[in-house]
Structures are given as C-alpha cells and as structure tokens.
C-alpha cells in the first residue's frame, strides 16, 4: 500500500519561516503534487503550490520556493508577513497523484513544543484517500 | 470540453485601462491556475503572470509588475486581468490560459489609440 | 530570465518533408529532482491560440500526431516534424517551464511550398 509522508519545520534562523518535505512511498509514476495549507485541497485548503515531474512547479505566496528533491518527494520554503504567515499551529496537506495507485494524500504540522529548528524525523502521517 | 471564453474586443485610448475577462466551463475552476499571456501583432508571446484561483494570490512578471492586477470572481467562474496606463505598446492580443498553458482562451485584442 | 532562442525564424517545405527547428534556453532546464527537461513546444495556426504540442521536452501532448517529435536537454531542445502535412502551417513556440518567469522564443515559421 503506497505511503505518504510530510514533514513540517521551522526554521531557527527566521521563526515566520517553515519548510514541508512530502514524498511518495510507492511503485507508481508520480503525476502531480499538490501541496496546501488549512486542511486538504478541495476541503477548504488553499494550494500554496503545484510540481509536475515534467511541465515544472508553479507556486504562490507565501511559498518561496518549492523544488523536486527526489523523483517522490518535495520541499516547499514559505516565508510570510503579517495575514499571509504560516504559524506554529497550520496544518500542511501533500497529495501525490500517481499511476495506477490514484491519489494520496497526508497532512501534517509543526510537532508540538518543538524547538525552532528541530522537528520530528519524516514518518508517514495519516492517510486519506482521494477519489 | 474545457473552455475559456474571452471578453471582446476594447478599443481604449493612451493613459486609460482596460479590465479582461476569461469564464471558464467545463472544469472545477479552483483546480487549475490561470494564466495571462500577452501577443503583440506578429510577435511572439509574453507570459505577463498567473493567479490562484482558491485564494487569489498572484504572481507578475517583473515587467507587467504595478500596472497588471490579476484577480478572480470563484462564484462565476471568471478570472480577470486589468492592465492600467495604457500605451500603444500594449496593443496586442491577450490570452488566458489555464493549467500548465494546456488550454488557451479565445484571445481579446485590445488596440490603445487616441 | 532564462532567454529562449529559436533558429530558423522561418523555413518553407513541401509536404511529405522532414523538418527540424532548434531553440535553445540561456539556462539549463533540466531539473535535477526529477531528470527531466521543462521545455514545451507549441504550434499557433493563423488566427489561433497556441495549442500545446509537447512538454517534458519529449512527452507528446494527448491528440498530437505522432509526425511531432521533441528532443534535446540541457539548453539545446529541437522539435522535428517527420512528415510535414498542409495543415502543420503555423508558428511554432518552446517555452521555458523551468523557472519564473515563463519565456517563450521568438518563433519558427512554418510555411508550405
């Protein structure tokens, strides 16, 4: 059964800044990524940014720079000021579109009482299917 | 079928603006980014920034940046693009495009004349 | 900005002709996550939007004959038309999918004798 895992940190350096690393733990193609913040994408998430293995990556504030690590997993840098700032409590969703498992997504957000800079090691998190 | 149907033709004069629409059918509107790309007469396209339709945040490129605003109506299913202090460099035809530049809409000329 | 350069600006073939067209990119667009190239290619008939024609550098796009052909990596990317039709007369893009802000080439005009 394919796995989704997320990852949430922030960092030490600027605390209004947070890194996602998402991957895909399966033997499908990757099609698309969708990563959101606020709750899964279609259910009341926003898509902070979206990484095609060929056509790219596209992203909108306050993403800053979203970038394939591996063929099955991602990293998202958001940066923000002021109404557009993550926070400690933001939930973070990646969906993985992939062939022929379909889609899956996982959710995530900052471990509690962790200190900038530290975060739990990536496991996958719940997973929610998406039809 | 996917389609972006484009306001008409504007006739505007040097100075004035000029607001484009772009209806989308045939999609969920939020699942796809659009696009606005510019076509001078003969020439070849110049992508001027894309919007996200769930929250409508924007990005510009840097040199239609302070005279493009694009925004978004989810309700109707339409995104817009106004271009502001308009001069005859931006007569043109101008596209939306949805996605990754998969669908392209019917295009609207706008001619700047006095 | 990545700058995309396209050679010839126009060529005139007869029908039944094999055709190539080069562009190349200021920058590399090969992604180093993935391996893959962000080039696409598009074809505007007169009077026309762009319609998509391959992406990935080499991915047809869904309904596209299988006479397009993309290749190429790094900055150097060619799109080749094994047997050009009456109906491929047009103006044919790449564009630069790899990095804000999208760039398109000057274009490859392409007529029939």
């Known amino acids: 059964t394919p796995e989704v895992w997320v990852q949430v940190r922030m960092e030490a350096t600027e605390l209004s800044s947070f890194t996602i690393r998402c991957g895909f733990l399966g033997s499908g193609s990757i099609s698309l990524v969708t990563v959101s913040w606020g709750g899964p994408n279609g259910a009341g998430g926003t898509t902070l940014a979206v990484l095609h293995p060929e056509r790219g990556i596209r992203q909108w504030a306050p993403a800053r720079q979203a970038r394939w690590e591996t063929q099955s997993s991602i990293s998202l840098i958001l940066e923000g000021s002021g109404a557009s700032s993550p926070c400690a409590n933001t939930t973070f969703c990646c969906k993985f579109a992939s062939f022929p498992e379909g889609s899956w997504e996982a959710c995530g957000s900052l471990p509690p009482s962790s200190d900038p800079g530290l975060s739990a090691p990536p496991t996958p998190a719940p997973i929610l299917r998406a039809d | 079928e996917v389609q972006l149907q484009q306001s008409g033709p504007e006739l505007v004069k040097p100075g004035a603006s000029v607001k484009i629409s772009c209806k989308a059918s045939?999609?969920?509107?939020?699942?796809?980014?659009m696009n606005w790309v510019k076509q001078s007469h003969g020439k070849s396209l110049e992508w001027i920034g894309d919007?996200?339709?769930?929250?409508?945040?924007?990005n510009y490129n840097q040199k239609f940046k302070g005279r493009a605003t694009l925004t978004v109506d989810k309700s109707s299913s339409t995104a817009y693009m106004e271009l502001r202090s308009l001069t005859s460099e931006d007569s043109a035809v101008y596209y939306c495009?949805?996605?990754?530049?998969?669908?392209w809409g019917t295009g609207t000329t706008v001619t700047v004349s006095s | 900005d990545i700058v995309m350069t396209q050679s010839p600006s126009s060529l005139s073939v007869s029908a039944g002709e094999k055709v190539t067209m080069s562009c190349k990119s200021s920058q590399s667009l090969l992604n180093s996550g993935t391996q893959k190239n962000y080039l696409a290619w598009y074809q505007q008939k007169p009077g026309q939007p762009p319609k998509l024609l391959i992406y990935?550098?080499?991915t047809r796009e869904s309904g596209v004959p299988d006479r397009f052909t993309g290749s190429g990596s790094g900055t150097d990317f060619t799109l080749t038309i094994s047997s050009v039709q009456a109906e491929d007369l047009a103006v044919y893009y790449c564009q630069n999918d790899h990095s804000y802000p999208w760039t398109f080439g000057g274009g490859t005009k392409l007529e029939i004798k």
């Open positions: 495009a949805s996605g990754y530049f998969d669908v």
């Open positions: 919007i996200n339709p769930n929250n409508g945040s924007p």
């Open positions: 045939g999609y969920t509107f939020t699942d796809y980014f």
């Open positions: 990935g550098a080499s």
